[in-house]
């Protein structure tokens, strides 16, 4: 009956953690004698190829300083402690502690048997590191050129994390990769870049980080912050201003970042009706008269700049009873 070595084609272990490389000789055959078990790294330099051996009488040996006896152990193999007990070598599973990047590679588990001869199996050990993720907005001031408005950082992953962005905005991502402080790891930074405008301010975009150490992708929301000058509109005009009306008000509606620092009401004619009183963002009209047949201008300033809106007013002699007209500027 033929025997075979059962190993996993690939084993993944966490950087700094412990991993087991399973290796079993199957099936159990009466009279099949396992004389030696060895673990080798065929791709390593010659003086580091022999990783471990288990001799039925002498037990385990770990000749190479890397990984060495401090970090290696046979999980189940047992030597014959007395002459009347047989060694148990069918399970040659090897445990490797304190995983380093240098541990990554092919490992061959080999059973020297009689009478079948030598049989072996190979496992690829992959050393992975779970990255730490972080995303943040980068406050920018509006401009005509694309600039990074958010960044997402996946620190010290192995292999490098994959970063993408979820957003309805018109954007592009710029990615950089640098070596992590832990040897063999990579820190990935993705910058969410767009032409910054008020439309992007306060919008939430999502950084999506994928890594094989995650059960599912990490989703990190980021609220953008764009400093832009006031975007102004005027509301309150209902196309039914008539002589003597007393309940009229104009509002200066503003979107800006940061908040406005000042509002200024004026007219294009340069004549400002005395019955119109500016109260910050509102213009309160005590009584409409013929001087209101003009264009009102609201000018708003903030730390970034200035914005203005105009509203043309038409003063009727009598109320318009045909129904309310359109409002807004």
């Amino acid at each position: 009956q033929d025997v075979r070595v059962q190993v996993l084609p690939e084993v993944r272990g966490q950087l700094g953690g412990t991993v087991e490389l399973p290796c079993h000789l199957l099936p159990p055959v009466p009279g099949l004698y396992i004389s030696l078990v060895t673990w080798q790294r065929p791709d390593a330099p010659p003086d580091h190829q022999n990783v471990a051996a288990f001799h039925p009488k002498m037990g385990p040996s770990f000749p190479s300083p890397k990984p060495g006896s401090q970090r290696l152990s046979f999980v189940s193999a047992k030597q014959s402690t007395r002459q009347d007990t047989e060694a148990e070598l069918q399970d040659a599973t090897l445990a490797l502690r304190g995983l380093t990047v240098e541990d990554e590679g092919n490992y061959t588990c080999e059973f020297a048997t009689f009478p079948k001869g030598s049989v072996r199996g190979m496992t690829w050990l992959r050393v992975i590191a779970k990255p730490q993720n972080h995303a943040e907005a980068q406050e920018v001031t509006f401009s005509q050129d694309p600039v990074p408005v958010a960044r997402c950082i996946s620190k010290e992953g192995r292999p490098p994390a994959r970063i993408s962005w979820l957003s309805s905005l018109d954007w592009e991502a710029k990615e950089t990769q640098v070596s992590g402080t832990l040897a063999g790891t990579v820190t990935v930074t993705s910058r969410f870049t767009l032409v910054p405008s008020g439309r992007a301010d306060g919008v939430t975009v999502t950084c999506k980080v994928e890594h094989e150490s995650f059960e599912e992708p990490a989703l990190i929301p980021v609220t953008l912050s764009v400093r832009y000058p006031p975007e102004v509109s005027i509301s309150g005009y209902d196309d039914n201003w008539y002589l003597g009306r007393t309940d009229a008000t104009l509002s200066c509606d503003v979107h800006s970042n940061p908040e406005p620092t000042g509002y200024d009401w004026s007219t294009t004619s340069g004549i400002f009706p005395t019955s119109a009183v500016a109260q910050g963002s509102q213009l309160v009209i005590h009584a409409v008269d013929s001087l209101f047949n003009t264009t009102f201008v609201c000018t708003v300033t903030n730390a970034v700049g200035m914005g203005r809106a105009e509203q043309v007013i038409f003063v009727r002699e009598t109320p318009n009873t045909a129904g309310a007209g359109a409002t807004g500027g």
Epitope: P30, G31, Y33, S35, L36, T38, Q40, Q49, N50, A53, H55, P56, K57, M58, P63, S80, Q83, D84, E86, A87, E110, A112, F114, P115, K116, G117, S118, R120
Partner: antibody, heavy 116, light 107 residues
Amino acid sequence: EVQLQQSGTVLTRPGASVKMSCKASGYIFTSYWIHWVKQRPGQGLEWIGAVYPGNSDSNYNQKFKAKAKLTAVTSTSTAYMELSSLTSEDSAVYYCTKLVGTFDYWGQGTTLTVSS
Amino acid sequence: DIVMTQSQKFMSSSIGDRVSVTCKASQNVGINVVWYQQRAGQSPKTLIYSASYRYSGVPDRFTGSGSGTDFTLTISNVQSEDLAEYFCQQYNTNPFTFGSGTKLEIK
């Protein structure tokens, strides 16, 4: 302590047969193969074959298949090798040995001289 | 069968010298090689197994190296008790085969 005690020196004629013994002690006889190795002066070592006392299974080097017969008697923990149709080429020291990782335990050897 | 060739039948060394005994396999045997020492009138004793692993109680002046087809037993700081014959053996494939031996003589 593991011991393999072999039978003494044999002097015999060409064409004859001889049966030599290897008595084992100090371990479970039925659990390990007993191997036989031939050594001629200046000719190195040759593996003849092995017998597994647990089920009397045997395994031979093809070169010695017609020459040697390996058996074991569990009741006396003794392995035997019978050599037939002897010629001067068979004159050698024959060792029984126990495989524990390597051939870790050896008998003292049986010297066979075939001469007319 | 796999042929294990020890090309040097004899080697001569002085006490304290370093000497290397070589063994070549006719085909790849991995690291499945043992080195034995046989003193005159005695049975062989294991020195090295799996090409480079030193057997229990063997002085560390004995080291084994090699894999595949080329193997070396190195004795550094040769002592008078090292006067013996040295054999390599492969256990990769049935039948097991031995080298023809290298006799170390002390000047």
